[in-house]
C-alpha cells in the first residue's frame, strides 16, 4: 500500500532571465527511493539515481543544474519555460509517486512564490 505523500513547491513564478529551484519531498513512507525523474510535460529533464548519480538530458544541459538535494535548478528562464513540471519518485516497494509544480515565468518583476501544497 502507498502511504507516502509528496510535498512540492506548488505554484511558483519567477522572472525572465532569472533562476528557480524546483523541489519535491517524499514523506510518510519508509520506501527506498530508487530514482527521481524530473519531467516537463512529456519531456525528460533530469534523472537522479541512487546508484548512478545525476543525469541532465542533453537538450537542457545548458540551463538545468542538479540539486539542491533531489531538486532541480532552472536557469536563464524564458517565457517558454512556463508550464507544468513533474517530479516522479520511483520507490521500492511502494511504486511511483508523482508531484506537480506549475511554473509561470513573468516578463516583469511581479514574480512571487505561491503556497506549498501536497499531493497524496
Amino acid at each position: 500500500m502507498m502511504t507516502g505523500t509528496i510535498e512540492t513547491t506548488g505554484n511558483i513564478s519567477a522572472e525572465k532571465g532569472g533562476s528557480i529551484i524546483l523541489q519535491c519531498h517524499l514523506s510518510s513512507t519508509t520506501a527506498q527511493v530508487t530514482q527521481v525523474n524530473w519531467e516537463q510535460q512529456d519531456q525528460l529533464l533530469a534523472i537522479c539515481n541512487a546508484d548512478l548519480g545525476w543525469h541532465i538530458s542533453p537538450s537542457f544541459k545548458d540551463r538545468v543544474a542538479p540539486g539542491p538535494g533531489l531538486g532541480l535548478t532552472l536557469q536563464s528562464l524564458t517565457v517558454n519555460d512556463t508550464g507544468e513540471y513533474f517530479c516522479i519518485y520511483h520507490t521500492y516497494p511502494d511504486g511511483t509517486y508523482t508531484g506537480r509544480i506549475f511554473l509561470e515565468v513573468l516578463e516583469s518583476s511581479v514574480a512571487e512564490h505561491g503556497a506549498r501544497f501536497q499531493i497524496p
Epitope: Q32, Q35, L44, I47, N49, D51, G53, H55, Y92
Partner: antibody
Framework: EVQLLESGGDLVQPGGSLRLSCAAS????????MSWVRQAPGKGLEWVSL????????YYADSVKDRFTISRDNSKNTLYLQMNSLRAEDTAVYYC?????????????WGQGTTVTVSS | QSVLTQPLSASGTPGQRVTISCSGV????????VSWYQQLPGTAPKLLIY???QRPSGVPDRFSGSKSGTSASLAISGLQSEDEADYYC???????????FGGGTKLTVL
C-alpha cells in the same frame, strides 16, 4: 525504429585484444544507461558491464574486471567494449542492451549480437 | 554458478499454465525489481516483464510476473507452441553492485 547494432566480433588468440562497438539509433542515446551481456555457446546469459549516461560511473562482472573497459561516445551514439587479455572462456556472443529509463527495471532493447571467439 | 536460481527445465501442453521460479537473496530480488526475458533459438533475448510485474507494450497478457520475498516467478497461461524458448530472470544486486542473471529455464511445449 529503436535499434542497436553490434560490430567488432572476431577470432582472436588468447592474450589478445578486441574492441566491440554498438551503434544506437531511433532514440536519445544520452538518456539511457547501457550494458553489455554475453552468452557462451550453449550457455546462459551473463552480464558483463554497465555504464551510466555520461560514462562517469561504470560497473563490471568479477570475471572481466581489470581486463574489459566499457565506454560510450554520446556524440556518435555509440557504446564500446574494450577487451584485453582475452581468454578462451570469453568466447561468446556479445549483446549490447539498453536499460529501461529506471535502469533497475530491466533491459528493454537488445542488439542482435556479435561473436567473439578466443582460440589459438 | 548463477546468483539467481532457476529450474533447468519446465514443460507443459498447449493451453496449460506454466510457472517458472527464480530464487535470489536479500540483496537482489527481495529489495529490487525483477525482469524476465524470452530467448527463442538463435535470436537475441526479448524483454517480457520489467519492474517485477509490468509488461512492455506488445507482450501478450498471457505472460505475468510476481514477486514475494527473495523469490520471483513468471507465469505463462494458455501455453502455445511458439512459447518454446529459454527464459531468464534478472535483477540488480545492491551488495555486488552488478546485474545478476538466473541460469535460464528451457521451456518445452509437449
Amino acid at each position: 525504429e529503436v535499434q542497436l547494432l553490434e560490430s567488432g566480433g572476431d577470432l582472436v588468440q588468447p592474450g589478445g585484444s578486441l574492441r566491440l562497438s554498438c551503434a544506437a539509433s531511433g532514440f536519445t542515446f544520452d538518456d539511457y544507461v547501457m550494458s553489455w551481456v554475453r552468452q557462451a555457446p550453449g550457455k546462459g546469459l551473463e552480464w558483463v558491464s554497465l555504464i551510466n549516461w555520461n560514462g562517469d560511473k561504470t560497473y563490471y562482472a568479477d570475471s572481466v574486471k581489470d581486463r574489459f573497459t566499457i565506454s560510450r561516445d554520446n556524440s556518435k551514439n555509440t557504446l564500446y567494449l574494450q577487451m584485453n587479455s582475452l581468454r578462451a572462456e570469453d568466447t561468446a556472443v556479445y549483446y549490447c542492451a539498453r536499460h529501461w529509463i529506471v535502469f533497475q527495471y530491466g533491459l528493454d532493447v537488445w542488439g542482435q549480437g556479435t561473436t567473439v571467439t578466443v582460440s589459438s | 554458478q548463477s546468483v539467481l536460481t532457476q529450474p533447468l527445465s519446465a514443460s507443459g501442453t498447449p493451453g496449460q499454465r506454466v510457472t517458472i521460479s527464480c530464487s535470489g537473496v536479500s540483496s537482489n530480488i527481495e529489495i529490487k525489481y525483477v525482469s524476465w526475458y524470452q530467448q527463442l533459438p538463435g535470436t537475441a533475448p526479448k524483454l517480457l516483464i520489467y519492474n517485477s510485474h509490468q509488461r512492455p507494450s506488445g507482450v501478450p497478457d498471457r505472460f505475468s510476473g510476481s514477486k514475494s520475498g527473495t523469490s520471483a516467478s513468471l507465469a505463462i497461461s494458455g501455453l502455445q507452441s511458439e512459447d518454446e524458448a529459454d527464459y531468464y530472470c534478472t535483477s540488480w544486486d545492491d551488495r555486488l553492485k552488478s546485474w545478476v542473471f538466473g541460469g535460464g529455464t528451457k521451456l518445452t511445449v509437449l
